[in-house]
């Protein structure tokens, strides 16, 4: 089976790399525009220059192209705790990230939120906080891991998964209740 090519890919594949087929005349291959520019007018004929114009402020193209418009620069999402790492230029989109001691959690492919790295209170750092992953904690005895925080076994209810980790403490609590001591 031959993979289906979109019209644009089909047209481009007829021309050598770095060129594209003229939309009105498929016998002409025009030179693509450099990154940081966009297509204003197709080349008038073979061997003649494509009319490329520089992207305006607030827009960019990051690779050679024959786009009729530059792409709008991304904005860092304040509500998600994002900060600007580097601003948008004509040939590169805005780069957004998180502050120091924070990590990115991706809710979807192109949406991330910044959260503070866990400090592992009542535990030890098993794996340090990374750009896209929270600290991995190991809890001290008498504590169990809940939502990446070390919580006292006194907060462990019988139905929760902590029962195995907190078994001695639970038995002690049960024993105290059974003996009727105050």
């Amino acid at each position: 089976l031959v993979p289906h090519l979109g019209d644009r890919e089909k047209r481009d594949s007829v021309c050598p790399q770095g060129k594209y087929i003229h939309p009105q005349n498929n016998s002409i291959c025009c030179t693509k525009c450099h990154k940081g520019t966009y297509l204003y007018n197709d080349c008038p004929g073979p061997g003649q220059d494509t009319d490329c114009r520089e992207c305006e402020s607030g827009s960019f193209t990051a690779s050679e192209n024959h786009l009729r418009h530059c792409l709008s620069c991304s904005k860092c999402r304040k509500e998600m705790g994002q900060v600007e790492i580097s601003s948008c230029t004509v040939d590169r989109d805005t780069v957004c990230g998180c502050r120091k001691n924070q990590y990115r959690h991706y809710w979807s492919e192109n949406l991330f939120q910044c959260f503070n790295c866990s400090l592992c209170l009542n535990g030890t750092v098993h794996l340090s906080c990374q750009e896209k992953q929270n600290t991995v904690c190991t809890c001290h005895a008498g504590f169990f891991l809940r939502e990446n925080e070390c919580v006292s076994c006194s907060n462990c209810k019988k139905s929760l998964e902590c029962t195995k980790l907190c078994l001695p403490q639970i038995e002690n609590v049960k024993g105290t209740e059974d003996s009727g001591t105050t």
Epitope: K78, E79, M80, H105, Q113, F115, E147
Partner: nanobody
Framework: EVQLLESGGGLVQPGGSLRLSCAAS????????MVWIRQAPGKGLEWVSH????????YYADSVKGRFTISRDNSKNTLYLQMNSLRAEDTAVYYC????????????WGQGTLVTVSS
């Protein structure tokens, strides 16, 4: 006690429209960015849209961009999701939630409203 109550779901034909509402109480609604998430039958949670505190900045998943509009009325403590040009793949339970603060989990979200798109 934080409460979020969604309404407005129902059965609609492909191409149709629905407007979901989420009534909020138990917290200062105007101080919280809000989120619509959905869960299609047998699938995981999908982030649909979110809106900042004042209703200025919005975000839409690619799958709903140009068809859905999120808005809020802080004077009524209500979040909305206007859904147009509905498709079969929009069939899901829709939940509103407060944007998480402390970690990547939804501490506060509603019971959901079912949207079914079918002819």
């Amino acid at each position: 006690e934080v409460q979020l109550l969604e309404s407005g779901g129902g059965l609609v034909q492909p191409g149709g429209s629905l407007r979901l509402s989420c009534a909020a109480s138990g917290f200062t609604f105007a101080h919280e960015p809000m989120v619509w998430i959905r869960q299609a039958p047998g699938k995981g949670l999908e982030w649909v849209s979110h809106i900042d505190r004042v209703g200025q900045d919005t975000y839409y998943a690619d799958s709903v961009k140009g068809r859905f509009t999120i808005s809020r009325d802080n004077s009524k403590n209500t979040l909305y999701l206007q859904m147009n040009s509905l498709r079969a793949e929009d069939t899901a339970v829709y939940y509103c939630a407060m944007l998480p603060k402390r970690g990547p989990r939804f501490d506060y979200w509603g019971q959901g409203t079912l949207v079914t798109v079918s002819s």
